[in-house]
Structures are given as C-alpha cells and as structure tokens.
Interface confidence: low
C-alpha cells in the first residue's frame, strides 16, 4: 500500500535569463528510496541514483545544477522552458511516487516567485 | 536522524535584519544539506534556501535572493540564516531542516516565529 505524499513547489514563475529551484519531497512513508528522475515532459533532466549519486543528461548539463539536497536549480532560462517538470520517486517496497511543477518563465522584469510547497 | 532546533525569531520592523540559527546534533555525519523553510499564516511552506555541509555552495528562492544569506558552522554544527531589507510577507514560522544522504528526506526542526511589522 502506497502512504507516501509527494510535496512539490507547486507552480512557479521566473524571469527570462534567470534560475529557479525545483523542490520535491516524500514524507509520510517509510520506503526506501532507489532513484529520482526530473523529467520535463518527455525528456528526462537528470537522475539522482542512490548508488551511483548524480547523472545531468548531456543536453541539460550547462544548465541544470543538481541540488540543493534532490531538488534541481535551471539556469539560464529561457521562454521555452516554460512548462511542466516532473519528480520521480522509485521506491522500495512502495514503487513510484511522482509529483508535478509548472514553470512559467516570463520576459517580464516583474515575475512573482510563487514558489510553495503544495499537496497534490 | 538529525535533531534540529532554531532560535533568533522575533518581531522586527520593515527594513531591519534578523539571524537565525539552527543547532544540529545527532546523526549529523549523516547531512548533506541543510536548509530553511518557511510558513506563513494560511500558506503552504515554502523553501527559503539550503547550504550543501560540506561544499558549502549556497541556494537561495528568489523571493530571497539578495537579502537573504545562509552560513554554517561546522565546527558548532550550526547552520545560519541572515535575513535583512526584511518585509512585512517575509512574516513566517522559519523552519531549519537537514538532508542526509543522498536520497533522505529533510528532517525538520521546530520552527521559529519571525513577524516583520509595517
């Protein structure tokens, strides 16, 4: 049985140029944890392995930063990282936790950082 | 698991500065990050910022970024949090919360009144 709550920073706004920290957690579970995966739609971000630690997939990696903890920090962002991302959370016994961020990068100077954790 | 506990909250006014601290002890071997958390009256917590223990290397929310600084102690297995050009959104419970391996979760402290007056 899955007990498990992914908490997320829920949707967030930046501006264009600058970064942003994605943030996930799974609480209430006692679970192990095998790997994350960040995913932005179908493409896969970077992986978080309990046993070979932190892998940036090659067309992210002058511009993803892992941490702070699992969470992911973007650079440099464009307009057209605007969307979802997704923390994928492999767990044994429990199986795959995921949670959603939207990310909306604006051109604006006046972007609000609505960042928050959220329970789904 | 890691024991936290925070201290240096109060009341302040816009513009004025407040440190925090938070005390670790237990399996602090164990912590990769550390990192402060916030919760405002009716709001979700949010996150302030983090410092990886060992590196040091600093992460920050934007709504932060620039007034806010995070520091640590290792000797004193203390993390801080220097907050100035405070505002009255910055009214929050702060929360100290420490990440250990490479895939724990954050283990959290009690948290901490900070209320920033107009």
């Known amino acids: 049985m899955m007990t498990g709550t992914i908490e997320t920073t829920g949707n967030i706004s930046a501006e264009k140029g600058g970064s942003i920290i994605l943030q996930c957690h799974l609480s209430s579970t006692t679970a192990q944890v095998t790997q994350v995966n960040w995913e932005q739609q179908d493409q896969l971000l970077a992986i978080c392995n309990a046993d070979l630690g932190w892998h940036i997939s090659p067309s992210f990696k002058d511009r993803v930063a892992p941490g702070p903890g699992l969470g992911l920090t973007l650079q440099s962002l464009t307009v057209n990282d605007t969307g979802e991302y997704f923390c994928i959370y492999h767990t044994y016994p429990d199986g795959t936790y995921t949670g959603r961020i939207f990310l909306e990068v604006l051109e604006s100077s006046v972007a609000e950082h609505g960042a928050r954790f959220q329970i789904p | 698991e890691v024991q936290l506990v925070e201290s240096g909250g109060g009341l302040v006014q816009a513009g004025g500065s407040l440190r925090l601290s938070c005390a670790a002890s237990g399996s602090i071997f164990s912590i990769s990050d550390m990192g402060w958390f916030r919760q405002a009256p009716g709001k979700e917590r949010e996150f302030v910022g983090a410092i990886n223990w060992l590196s040091e290397s600093t992460y920050y929310a934007d709504s932060v970024k620039g007034r806010f600084t995070i520091s640590a102690d290792n000797a004193k297995n203390t993390v801080y949090l220097q907050m100035n050009s405070l505002k009255p959104e910055d009214t929050a419970v702060y929360y100290c919360?420490?990440?250990?391996?490479?895939?724990?979760?954050?283990?959290w402290g009690q948290g901490t009144q900070v209320t920033v007056s107009s």
């Open positions: 919360a420490a990440q250990g391996g490479v895939l724990s979760g954050w283990d």
